[in-house]
């Protein structure tokens, strides 16, 4: 497996745990969410991580000014999304630069599922199904 | 002891079964045991479930049902170290939709 | 609103114990992470000890090995058991509390005083 792909809780350093919460979001098109991770905030900075399917590798997440934005509370980091939109599906992953290491850690990851109906092919099913 | 990450959530339909796995580096003497943490509910402790069924340590929960949703996780224990717990799968359980009342075959609208 | 109550801080010689206890106006079902951060005179504010949901613990490397975290779900409480005290862990130690939604509450704060 690749080393993305697997982690461990090491006794090692101070920044190799990051905790991540909620693991799985269902909303409604057009709600806010908002996701947290917690963690040494001295042992280096935080950033967000995205990825469509299971077996992606993430990429960095390009924060849409004005509808996501993350902050930071000392150890508690929290990326809100707003008005989600069906492209936001997705896991979404917290990620700690150690500043001694240069080691990489994540948090587990948050799923965030954006319900309603995305194409106007689901919609007329729908109405079939009620017809 | 290294756990590899598992699916955030698994999708199963109302009376199918759900199959979680909890892959580790483990040898074959480590102890899985799977718990639910009921999603949104933070109490301690979570549920315990059990033993995990193979070397894999799988969890198989028949016959799913709505009251089996939340969060599944396995634990990875060799001798006497610290447990290391998987990150979790949510398992969401579809109700299949209703099938339409005229949903009846082409020879039996013509009789 | 929630309070935190912390107690347990004072003076004591280096290499002495001392344990923290922070009371929670919450039920343990609405807490994530309890946690303790210190901040020393001059310096900015640090996390020392963090226990989760699931029961996981993170800790600072200046104090693993020495210092203990634990909470009573029933009381709603964290402690933190501090072993083999040096000069350097005096500060004002702070417990913290997040709750699932990401809110976030802090006590006042109690003194550690590690002197001879």
């Known amino acids: 497996a690749r080393s993305e792909d697997r982690y461990r809780n090491p006794k090692g350093s101070a920044c190799s745990r990051i905790w991540q919460s909620p693991r799985f979001i269902a909303r409604k098109r057009g709600f806010t969410v908002k996701m947290h991770c917690y963690m040494n905030s001295a042992s280096g900075n935080v950033s967000w991580l995205w990825k469509q399917e299971m077996d992606e590798n993430p990429q960095q997440l390009k924060l849409e000014k004005g509808r996501m934005e993350e902050s930071q509370n000392e150890s508690l980091a929290t990326l809100t999304i707003q008005g989600i939109r069906f492209e936001d599906n997705g896991i979404y992953f917290c990620q700690q630069k150690c500043n001694n290491t240069s080691e990489v850690y994540q948090g587990c990851g948050t799923e965030l599922r954006v319900m309603g109906f995305s194409t106007l092919a689901q919609l007329k099913q729908r109405n079939t199904l009620k017809d | 002891l290294w756990m590899h990450k598992v699916p955030a959530s698994l999708m199963v339909s109302l009376g199918e079964d759900a199959h979680f796995q909890c892959p580790h580096n483990s040898s074959n003497n480590a102890n899985v045991t799977w718990w639910r943490v009921l999603h949104g509910n933070y109490t301690w402790p979570p549920e315990f479930l059990g033993p995990g069924e193979d070397p894999n340590g799988t969890l198989i929960i028949q016959n799913v049902n709505k009251s089996h949703g939340g969060i599944y996780v396995c634990r990875v224990q060799e001798g006497n170290e610290s447990y290391q717990q998987s990150c979790g799968t949510y398992l969401r359980v579809r109700q299949p939709p209703p099938r339409p009342f005229l949903d009846m075959g082409e020879g039996t609208k013509n009789r | 609103d929630v309070q935190l109550q912390e107690s347990g801080g004072g003076l004591v010689q280096p290499g002495g114990s001392l344990s923290l206890s922070c009371a929670a106006s919450?039920?343990?079902?609405?807490?994530?992470?309890r946690a303790w951060h210190r901040q020393a005179p001059g310096k900015q504010r640090e996390l020392v000890a963090a226990?989760?949901?699931?029961?996981?613990?993170m800790y600072a490397d200046s104090v693993k090995g020495r210092f203990t975290i634990s909470r009573d779900n029933a009381k709603t409480t964290v402690s933190l058991q501090m072993n083999s005290l040096k000069p350097e862990d005096t500060a004002v130690y702070y417990c913290?509390?997040?709750?699932?939604?990401?809110?976030?509450?802090w006590g006042q704060g109690t003194q550690v005083t590690v002197s001879s």
């Open positions: 226990i989760n949901n699931d029961g996981q613990t």
């Open positions: 913290n509390v997040v709750t699932p939604k990401g809110h976030q509450y």
């Open positions: 919450i039920s343990s079902s609405s807490i994530w992470v």
